[in-house]
């Protein structure tokens, strides 16, 4: 069964900067990745970025840079312009659309006690939505 993992990492140097890492574990080719926060895409969440393997990416504030790390994983840098970061208690979700498996989505957040530079373990919290 394909799985999606999500890691949320606070940057050690800047407490207002976060990076979300997501990856797809499974066969098939990825056709699209959608990163959202506040909940799953299309279920109360707000899109932060869309990444297409050939056409490029599209991102919205407060996302700063979305990029492919490997053929099956992406990273999204976030920057909070406010005094206190809203990201600490936020859920980030990544949805991978792949052929022929369909869509797989998982969510993750920064552990409450995490120190700068530490990240959430890459355990998928699967939302079993195989569209």
């Amino acid at each position: 069964t394909p799985e999606v993992w999500v890691q949320v990492q606070m940057e050690a140097t800047e407490l207002s900067s976060f990076t979300v890492h997501c990856g797809f574990l499974g066969p098939g080719s990825i056709s699209l990745v959608t990163v959202s926060w506040g909940g799953p895409d299309g279920a109360g969440g707000t899109k932060l970025a869309v990444l297409h393997p050939e056409l490029g990416t599209r991102q919205w504030a407060p996302a700063r840079q979305a990029r492919w790390e490997t053929q099956s994983s992406i990273s999204l840098a976030l920057e909070d312009s406010g005094a206190s970061s809203p990201f600490a208690n936020t859920t980030f979700c990544c949805k991978f659309a792949s052929f022929p498996e369909g869509s797989w989505e998982s969510c993750g957040s920064l552990p409450p006690s995490s120190d700068p530079g530490l990240s959430a373990p890459p355990t998928p919290v699967p939302i079993l939505r195989a569209d």
């Epitope: 699209l32 895409d41 299309g42 707000t46 899109k47 869309v50 297409h52 490029g56």
Partner: antibody, heavy 118, light 107 residues
Framework: DVQLVESGGGLVKPGGSLKLSCAAS????????MYWVRQTPEKRLEWVAT????????YYPDNVKGRFTISRDTAKNNLYLQMSHLKSEDTAMYYC???????????WGQGTLVTVSA | DIVMTQSHKFMSTSVGDRVSITCKAS??????VAWFQQKPGQSPKLLIY???TRHTGVPDRFTGSGSGTDFTLTISNVQSEDLADYFC?????????FGGGTKLEIK
């Protein structure tokens, strides 16, 4: 077919208010970021407002911040732009737009004209 | 704010020719640039995004290039229906900004 139809434009005095509407059809309205872009009589294009897919977040350029409010009614598939404290420099054709996947401002309505004049 | 400058307000060309419309950003915008075409009496239409990706249905005579601060829209084998205003736009950072436009005239 994607359709965006703006309405609500007209002549308004400086300091007045106006609410623009955009009726959307042919796509999943709730899953898309939506935007208002305007074009001045000199043909200059200006981004005016953004609303996120979940309607939780809105963004504006400084020249309209505090005067304009973008909102959406997902049940009616409508996008709105409430404009207040209007100035003569707000005179423009106002367009409702949306993205397609990663392509910005991929679809535009036909526009609605707002004229601010005494 | 990032200023997008289209130095040529007007450009004149003939059917069958090749023309290049340029756009300069006041600071680095990577490749987050789009090009729009607006024919007389119509709404703008997306031609190119990510500096060089053609939008669906756009003829391959339209080509976008550039990165950083300098961008070009090239129309090869110009057709009479290409008579229009052309605008560049950056979406690298808020506020998203447009160039002032270049009007393409057909001789």
């Amino acid at each position: 077919d994607v359709q965006l139809v703006e309405s609500g434009g007209g002549l308004v005095k400086p300091g007045g208010s106006l609410k623009l509407s955009c009726a959307a059809s042919g796509f999943s309205f709730s899953e898309n970021y939506m935007y208002w872009v305007r074009q001045t009589p000199e043909k200059r294009l200006e981004w005016v407002a953004t609303i996120s897919d979940g309607a939780s977040y809105t963004y504006y350029p400084d020249n309209v911040k505090g005067r304009f409010t973008i909102s959406r009614d997902t049940a009616k598939n409508n996008l709105y732009l409430q404009m207040s404290h209007l100035k003569s420099e707000d005179t423009a054709m106002y367009y409702c737009t949306r993205d397609e996947l990663i392509a910005p401002f991929a679809y535009w309505g036909q526009g609605t004209l707002v004229t601010v004049s005494a | 704010d990032i200023v997008m400058t289209q130095s040529h307000k007007f450009m004149s060309t003939s059917v069958g020719d090749r023309v290049s419309i340029t756009c300069k950003a006041s600071q680095d915008v990577g490749t987050a640039v789009a090009w729009f075409q607006q024919k007389p009496g119509q709404s703008p239409k997306l031609l190119i995004y990510w500096a060089s990706t053609r939008h669906t249905g756009v003829p391959d005579r339209f080509t976008g290039s550039g990165s950083g601060t300098d961008f070009t829209l090239t129309i090869s084998n110009v057709q009479s229906e290409d008579l229009a205003d052309y605008f560049c736009q950056q979406y690298n950072s808020y506020p998203w900004t447009f160039g002032g436009g270049t009007k393409l005239e057909i001789k």
